[in-house]
Interface confidence: low
Amino acid sequence: DTYKSEIAHRFKDLGEQYFKGLVLIAFSQHLQQCPYEEHVKLVREVTEFAKTCVADESAENCDKSIHTLFGDKLCAIPSLREHYGDLADCCEKEEPERNECFLQHKNDNPDIPKLKPDPVALCADFQEDEQKFWGKYLYEIARRHPYFYAPELLYYAIIYKDVFSECCQAADKAACLLPKIEHLREKVLTSAAKQRLKCASIQKFGERAFKAWSLARLSQRFPKADFTEISKIVTDLAKVHKECCHGDLLECADDRADLAKYICENQDTISTKLKECCDKPLLEKSHCIAEAKRDELPADLNPLEHDFVEDKEVCKNYKEAKHVFLGTFLYEYSRRHPDYSVSLLLRIAKIYEATLEDCCAKEDPPACYATVFDKFQPLVDEPKNLIKQNCELFEKLGEYGFQNALIVRYTKKVPQVSTPTLVEVARKLGLVGSRCCKRPEEERLSCAEDYLSLVLNRLCVLHEKTPVSEKVTKCCTESLVNRRPCFSALTPDETYKPKEFVEGTFTFHADLCTLPEDEKQIKKQTALVELLKHKPHATEEQLRTVLGNFAAFVQKCCAAPDHEACFAVEGPKFVIEIRGILA
């Protein structure tokens, strides 16, 4: 369809509330340091303008693309250079280069303090102005997560508002709110990580990589749908995510709504698990479809070997329509293996492709590819064994101990990576234990590997901003599906020159005593990384002793009448002790 005014078209399709929410998200993801009020002003102006275009599509500037309109708005901010430095240089470019430039300036690790929920204050804000409260939530999440999936953020904002509608009437607001907010926070962080991986796969490895990922995922979830149906959804989904990752949030939300509508209209041929989703309002419907339970496998499936090994036409089919043939292989293999991670399925498809590429050029292709399925077993065994070993370690050490083991492992592999990044990534890797090790055997593999893909993508995104390790660059850029095996295979870096011992790194203060448990752990784990950077060959025994002594030293000073005085006296002694243990 062609419209005279794109902005009028989107406003009419989305309605004022969602339109405003999405515009707010768009601006917050680009200008991550601007105060909320500034954004509200921009949103108000854009909304007023959109309304004039709805009234008259031929009005001045209504025919401009949304990129042009948004970019002009950003570039009109007087303090742009002062607050955002070289982002202002983008304004000298023409579209579409200007938009590309804005995208490159999104900051995945903005210097914004962590949100600390204060139930009483939040309930007061909520009761005073529900609309502002909703907007503030969108703004705070979007500026911290500049690639957050915008239509999904609108969904979470509704849930957030719901939590407050219920809990602000409760006698004990904190008891009602805090566990719910914490649970929602975990969901939101996982959603942010999932979308960041989708955007990275599109931006760094191309649309085909994302389509392959989606094909495997959707085939696992909707095994009753035929290949053509899955392919159509994959194509539409790729368009939606390309738009959102590219900052075209209005188009993305509109297309996502169309896709949800299509899926619901065709649910009989897609999945039996969608009925409930399709009765819900739009945002919940789309969320529900994305999280839908896996449908049961059809009973009458042929063994895979029939079509992909024993069929005499394998090479003919492969040569005539490579992508389609490999797509059907990935579809058929994935729908039969809901227990495999998406990355594992894609590795298997890669091996199948490489085997056909090799065998179909040979004298006797069928003899050559006859054993291709045997080649898959080592690919399956590797992550299974790794997960088994790591889950045993997790059971033995508990979450904190397991995180520390991973901190040691990863600091030795890539000691050049910044300490905050190593701590953040190893802590998140460590959560795989509590997330996946308790799951039934058939869910463990996909749970663990798909989660690790999210965490390693975070490492890759942070490292790309300030590259310091060739090993990390190699694992991050060579192959999306082999990232996890690549990192797993890294050995301790023997070329690393240890850091000088800096006493300041091991200086602690009284504030340590009042920190919440997780922040206390981060302080200790930061010290552990620094210790390893100084002594990369420290033994497990030495590290255990240092950590034990550190815990005792902190406990002693936090029990002392004057915390700060104790840290001042005991701190230097602790440093001498560390140096002695590691000498």
Epitope: I159, D162, V163, E166, K180, H183, L184, E276, E284, K293
Partner: nanobody, 126 residues
Framework: EVQLLESGGGLVQPGGSLRLSCAAS????????VAWFRQAPGKEREFVAG????????YYADSVKGRFTISRDNSKNTLYLQMNSLRPEDTAVYYC???????????????????WGQGTLVTVSS
């Protein structure tokens, strides 16, 4: 549409234990906010315990905290109420209720639950 069927009620002595079950059909129980309510003769229906949809955050009435435990087994699509240290004032018909829709949200307000079981009687008496 959700169908709920309670079982496990009966006569028990003060200080004793009972485990109520509520089998759900027509919907996955882990996607639904579910709760136990009870109604003693001549009294209003009151909230006992609840668990959010898609999340195991549990809620209890003050009168049962520490004695009752709500849980669900997703593989069996069943909700449970483990009742320990029972008292005569716990005597009532116990109902299981479901509130599909949003995750996280459970409520102590009976009117917000569209789906109910037929109830199971628990009598605590010596």
């Amino acid at each position: 549409e959700v169908q709920l069927l309670e079982s496990g009620g009966g006569l028990v002595q003060p200080g004793g234990s009972l485990r109520l079950s509520c089998a759900a059909s027509g919907r996955y129980i882990d996607e639904t906010a579910v709760a136990w309510f009870r109604q003693a003769p001549g009294k209003e229906r009151e909230f006992v315990a609840g668990i959010g949809g898609g999340v195991d955050i549990t809620y209890y009435a003050d009168s049962v905290k520490g004695r009752f435990t709500i849980s669900r087994d997703n593989s069996k699509n069943t909700l449970y109420l483990q009742m320990n240290s029972l008292r005569p004032e716990d005597t009532a018909v116990y109902y299981c209720a479901a509130r599909p829709g949003r995750p996280l949200i459970t409520s102590k307000v009976a009117d917000l639950y569209p789906y109910w079981g037929q109830g199971t009687l628990v009598t605590v008496s010596s």
